[in-house]
């Protein structure tokens, strides 16, 4: 039969899942069918267990014991199960691992321990546990990793420490878990690592030591290599020296962001041909940008906050599938042709020292949409520096030294920004973008040309109706946009406005003529300058 | 089958230098510390240090320091041991071993022998 | 350094019979419960051959006659039944700290 209020079903083998969870039950069910398979007393207010509780249960595979009120678990308690493949005491009180609870359990694969309160593991607490693959020891009070416990453990392929309160790991911590695929040790208090922590590692794919004190980059992880994905961000590294990655190959993800990194060997980021994307910001000891050999199959570079002040003349051939390049704050002057990053997409470059475009800097770049060249010093852009950027819709070139702007190749716009470069008076005819929608220029009269004078009085006039709002709401001169005074009307307005803008070919530009600033008079100012 | 296959004999005059080569092959090159032993004849063991292949990680028998210097080479992976301002009590045979099992060296080279001799 | 002695510096046992090395470091070669203390065989004119590795565990491929115990400073490799191809010489070594350092040696004989 099925135990009182539980609820069991067949489980397609003959044998029988038993859910006892979250029943209030301060002792283990007596009458449970010598084919239970699967039997969960989670979540109750289970607080001792007696020897031998479960006599008979040949067939347990999965005993789920997790949330209960355990402080100790006697010899005995799991005699006889023979099968059990999953033990899960988590969220009890346990102060340390049942070593002789978990003894001649030759089967188990899976053990959870975690959200406990040990602290101390025994040496040989694991050594009957043979077949034991997945191992949790998060969120407990180790201070210390159980070096001699986990000699036993050479099938173990998954493992957590995360969550103690470990502050160093020795030499060959783990040394014999030849399989571990998996290792978390995030969220202790991590300040040091042997030079050969790590070794014995050799299967090793995953290693988390984010969220730790390290002061120094884990050059233990040298020996392992097939690593695959590495996190050691939020800890207080200052630089990661030459060759960092050189022992770990099979890198597709690094995780090092939220660390004080000053300096980057020039080397440090080679011969990772599986890494995808690498970003580095305020980095302020780089003075050269990374030797990137080897590390062919890049997507994504984020260089930002360094000092920068040249790119070699073959980055790109260095990286042919780039997509997305930012090195947005550096030094950067002179630029090579970037036309061999044929995948290019996104190129930020915002707050450098450049000073020109030249004809060959962005050539046949098919594929980018935005090009950032704000805060720089470019006076010069050759007449065909972007005619030859089909997919281009993005183009930021505020806050430069411009005196003329080149539109050839650019009638795919969207998006221009002209801003802050005080001697581009020209105007700028909106036959060249028909596709815009955003533009803000230098100056107020330049956006009569794009029809905002008429527009702007025919769309703020036909929104006034029963609005109290004055015209000074209206026309944003900084925003170049308008004010909606009921939050719940917006995405109504946006939608209705946008229709607007469409059905009089209108387009957002700033800074935008106001009523005391009507373009008849903007155009004659510019007529008589 | 993981092997140490080193460089043959060497006899040198004092004062000159001797790099012996050590080249591995059957596993991960990059993965495994490779140690430097020498055995003077009829005598013990003298370790002179180690270092991880492909990087730059090294570590010297102080007393070895000034004069020998490890190398690696990952397209071939072989490492090297160079020893400088050799003298007569350098006569020994030098082996290239793999720091295995928590540091113990579960494959040796099979030695060379350097002579210094004037 | 830590200095690594062995005795005796020979041994000569029968066919047959137990024979027993011991090895003390100057100083505890402990660490988290492991003992950085390893087991070598070293036939003439062969490289050493590694049998027992942190203390107490055997080398794969190396017969079981061949044992070790201790911990801390005072180290035994025991042979149960001397066979004719373990005439050798045996040495220790620890990797505890820099620079390693090998036993002199113990030179195994049959008596």
């Known amino acids: 039969g099925c135990p009182t209020h539980c609820h069991c079903e067949p489980d397609g083998r003959m044998l029988l899942r038993v859910d006892c969870s979250d029943l209030g039950l301060s002792e283990l069910p007596s009458n449970l069918s010598v084919f239970t398979s699967y039997l969960d007393l989670s979540m109750n207010n289970i607080s001792q267990l007696l020897p031998n509780p479960l006599p008979s249960l040949r067939f347990l595979e999965e005993l789920r014991l997790a949330g209960n009120a355990l402080t100790y678990i006697p010899k005995g308690a799991f005699t006889g199960l023979y099968s059990l493949k999953v033990l899960m005491l988590q969220n009890n009180q346990l102060r340390q691992v049942p070593t002789e609870a978990l003894q001649n359990l030759r089967s188990l694969q899976s053990l959870r321990l975690d959200a406990n309160h040990i602290s101390y593991v025994p040496p040989s607490c694991f050594s009957g546990l043979h077949s034991l693959r997945h191992l949790w020891l998060d969120d407990n009070a180790l201070t210390e990793i159980p070096v001699q416990a986990f000699r036993s453990l050479s099938a173990l392929q998954a493992m957590t420490l995360a969550l103690n309160k470990i502050h160093h790991i020795p030499d060959y911590a783990f040394g014999n878990l030849s399989s571990l695929v998996v290792l978390h040790l995030h969220n202790n208090r991590i300040h040091s690592l042997g030079k050969k922590c790590f070794d014995g590692l050799h299967s090793l794919e995953t290693l988390d030591l984010n969220y730790n004190n390290l002061d120094e980059f884990p050059t233990a992880i040298r020996t392992l290599s097939n690593l695959k994905e590495l996190g050691f961000h939020s800890n207080n590294i200052r630089s990661i020296p030459e060759k960092a990655f050189v022992g770990n190959p099979s890198l597709i993800t690094i995780h090092f962001y939220d660390n004080p990194i000053q300096f980057v060997g020039r080397s440090a980021f080679q011969h990772l041909p599986e890494l995808r994307t690498l970003t580095l910001n305020g980095a302020s000891q780089i003075t050269e940008f990374p030797d990137l050999t080897g590390t062919a199959n890049l997507e994504s570079l984020t260089l930002t906050g360094a000092q920068i002040s040249s790119l070699p003349q073959t980055v790109c051939n260095q990286l042919p599938n780039l997509q997305v390049l930012d090195l947005s704050y550096n030094l950067l002057e002179d630029l090579p042709s970037f036309s061999v990053c044929q995948k290019l997409q996104k190129i930020d470059l915002r707050h450098n020292e450049i000073y020109e475009i030249k004809v060959d800097t962005f050539q046949q770049l098919l594929s980018l949409r935005s090009l950032n060249l704000a805060w720089n010093k470019i006076a010069i852009i050759h007449p065909n520096a972007f005619s030859t950027l089909p997919s281009l819709i993005k183009l930021d070139l505020s806050s430069n030294l411009l005196s003329s702007f080149p539109v050839t190749g650019l009638h795919g716009l969207t998006h221009l920004k002209l801003t802050g470069n005080h001697a581009l008076q020209s105007l700028i005819s909106s036959e060249n973008f028909p596709e815009l929608k955003i533009i803000e220029m230098p100056y107020a009269y330049q956006c009569c040309a794009f029809g905002v004078c008429e527009n702007a009085y025919k769309i703020s006039n036909q929104w006034n109706k029963g609005d109290n709002s004055s015209m000074d709401d209206l026309h944003k001169k900084d925003a170049g946009m308008f004010q909606v005074q009921d939050e719940r009307d917006l995405e109504d307005f946006l939608l209705d406005f946008e229709e607007d803008l469409k059905a009089l070919h209108s387009v957002q530009c700033s800074p935008s003529p106001g009523p005391f600033k009507p373009c008849e008079h903007l155009l004659d100012g510019w007529l008589i300058r | 089958e993981v092997q140490l296959v080193q460089s043959g004999a060497e006899v040198k005059k004092p004062g000159a230098s001797v790099k012996v080569s050590c080249k591995a092959s059957?596993?991960?090159?990059?993965?495994?510390?490779i140690e430097w032993v020498r055995q003077a004849p009829g005598q013990g063991l003298e370790w002179i240090g180690e270092?991880?292949?492909?990087?730059?990680?090294?570590d010297y028998n102080e007393k070895f320091k000034v004069r020998a210097t490890f190398t690696s080479d990952t397209s071939t992976s072989t490492v090297y041991l160079e020893l400088s301002s050799l003298r007569s009590e350098d006569t020994a045979v030098y082996y290239c071993?793999?720091?295995?099992?928590?540091?113990?060296?579960?494959?040796w080279g099979q030695g060379t022998l350097v002579t210094v001799s004037s | 350094d830590i200095v690594m002695t062995q005795s005796p510096d020979s041994l000569a046992v029968s066919l047959g019979e137990r024979a027993t090395i011991n090895c003390r470091a100057s100083?505890?070669?402990?660490?988290?419960?492991?003992?950085?203390m390893h087991w070598y065989q070293q036939k003439p004119g062969q490289p050493p051959k590694l049998l027992i590795y942190?203390?107490?565990n055997l080398e794969s491929g190396v017969p079981d006659r061949f044992s070790g115990s201790g911990s801390g400073t005072d180290f035994t490799l025991t042979i149960s039944s001397l066979q004719a191809e373990d005439v050798a010489v045996y040495y220790c070594?620890?990797?505890?700290?820099?620079?390693?350092?090998f036993g002199q040696g113990t030179k195994v004989e049959i008596k």
């Open positions: 942190l203390a107490s």
């Open positions: 070594q620890q990797n505890y700290e820099d620079p390693f350092t």
């Open positions: 100083e505890s070669v402990d660490n988290y419960g492991n003992s950085f």
């Open positions: 059957g596993y991960t090159f990059s993965a495994y510390w």
């Open positions: 071993a793999r720091g295995g099992h928590y540091g113990s060296l579960d494959y």
């Open positions: 270092i991880l292949p492909g990087s730059d990680s090294t």
